[in-house]
Interface confidence: medium
């Protein structure tokens, strides 16, 4: 039901990235334009984004407010123009999204290897703590804070004139691995929530070799 | 499908150890924290610690720490708890139970009674 | 540690009966808070976990509620196969906490 000038919102997606949350759908709008709400399973609906022609909302900050709760969005049409007009049923038109579960379903970011210092024939590695839009008493949380020991890194690593890949895994942000002495190394990490069924791995992270800036060497 | 196989009842004296098993299936075992939690008869559930399979790292309910050992067998798939010095008040069902993602215990063991008695 | 205080420790209600079990933290544990259903010589089993929501294949007459420290754990229509003690547990801080449990039995 509504009017013959409005379309329903289909294809509605969550796009989350470190807590980061998008919502979009279809379809770009002809002579209407959208409202979003988002509700938890027990809450009421807040709207976001009145009267909006873009075709996605931020809701993060709603979302952040508890990343285990279950939350559930709706994307209401109206006519561009006569956003009080409503469908035959008294309502303007409207499509739901699928439940989104922050904690279980945002996608890992691609993580950044922070540092590596070279002691002898060992490696420290440590991976930038990224920071997330998570609060709590006024502070912004890191991925780390979020997850706690849910979080791991897998650490790959190479000697720069072979391309055999051995890996490392921490629950810190940390890496110490045994090198070659005299050998120059490449990492490359990524962020892994293994007991996850979706969205388990992030993308690797951008490769960082010995003998470039980012390093420090110490010969004891 | 998802399993968890304890060892079998067992029957100690006080100031002995003993050691429980737990063989996993069905899933990756490396990929989820095992937790073991115990229930003295007629009484509720006290968890005792958990053990990474992946790093052999564990945490401790401190109320255990200095009598209890968690560790892991990659190659058999196979969680362990020893408990040591036991005493009668160490009498319980002792079950392995699987945390998933967030920290809710998702499958359990079918429980090993263990029972101290002089 | 976090306490957690579960009340009535025991009840007894009529099949049909809508049945309501309280679980309250010592400090808050967010939505930490999951419920396990555990019959007599059985392991436990998880029902609900983030507060709220239902585990695979747990019927929809079981629901959670609550935030912070307060929570509520419900058995909409009691069935005869319910009877059992339930148990809450924050996973919000370790050591994780279990209630003391409630035995739920039919009049």
């Known amino acids: 039901s509504g009017t013959t000038n409005t379309v329903a919102a289909y294809n509605l997606t969550w796009k989350s990235t470190n807590f980061k949350t998008i919502l979009e759908w279809e379809p770009k709008p002809v002579n209407q334009v959208y409202t979003v709400q988002i509700s938890t399973k027990s809450g009421d609906w807040k709207s976001k984004c009145f009267y909006t022609t873009d075709t996605e909302c931020d809701l993060t900050d709603e979302i952040v407010k508890d990343v285990k709760q279950t939350y559930l969005a709706r994307v209401f049409s109206y006519p561009a123009g006569n956003v009080e007009s409503t469908g035959s049923a008294g309502e303007p038109l409207y499509e739901n999204s699928p439940e989104f579960t922050p904690y279980l379903e945002t996608n890992l970011g691609q993580p950044t290897i922070q540092s590596f210092e070279q002691v002898g024939t060992k490696v420290n590695v440590t991976v930038e703590d990224e920071r997330t839009l998570v609060r709590r008493n006024n502070t912004f949380l890191s991925l780390r804070d979020v997850f706690g020991k849910d979080l791991i890194y897998t650490l790959y690593y190479w000697k720069s004139s072979s391309s055999g890949k051995k890996t490392a895994k921490t629950n810190t942000n940390e890496f110490l691995i045994d090198v070659d002495k005299g050998e120059n190394y490449c990492f490359s990490v990524q962020a892994v929530i293994p007991s996850r069924t979706v969205n388990r791995k992030s993308t690797d992270s951008p490769v960082e070799c010995m003998g470039q800036e980012k390093g420090e060497f110490r010969e004891i | 499908e998802v399993q968890l196989v304890q060892s079998g009842a067992e029957v100690k004296k006080p100031g002995a150890s003993v050691k429980v098993s737990c063989k996993a299936s069905g899933y990756s075992f490396t990929g989820y924290y095992m937790n073991w939690v115990r229930q003295a008869p007629g009484q509720g559930l006290e968890w005792m610690g958990e053990?990474?399979?992946?790093?052999?790292?564990?945490t401790y309910n401190q109320k255990f720490k200095a009598r209890v050992t968690l560790t892991v067998d990659q190659s058999t798939n196979t969680a362990y708890m020893e408990l040591s010095s036991l005493r009668s008040e160490d009498t319980a069902v002792y079950y392995c139970?699987?945390?998933?993602?967030?920290?809710?215990?998702?499958?359990w063991g079918q429980g090993t009674t263990v029972t101290v008695s002089s | 540690s976090i306490q957690m205080t579960q009340s009535p420790s025991s009840l007894s209600a009529s099949v049909g009966d809508r049945v309501t079990i309280t679980c309250k933290a010592s400090q808050s544990v967010s939505q930490g808070i999951a419920w396990y259903q555990q019959k007599p010589g059985k392991s436990p089993k998880l029902l609900i976990y983030f507060a709220s929501n239902r585990y695979t294949g747990v019927p929809s007459r079981f629901s959670g509620s609550g935030y912070g420290t307060d929570f509520t754990f419900t058995i909409s229509s009691l069935q005869p196969e319910d009877i059992a003690t339930y148990y809450c547990q924050q996973d919000y801080s370790s050591p994780w906490t279990f209630g003391g449990g409630t035995k739920v039995e039919i009049k």
């Open positions: 053990i990474n399979p992946s790093t052999g790292g564990s």
């Open positions: 139970a699987r945390r998933e993602l967030g920290g809710p215990f998702g499958y």
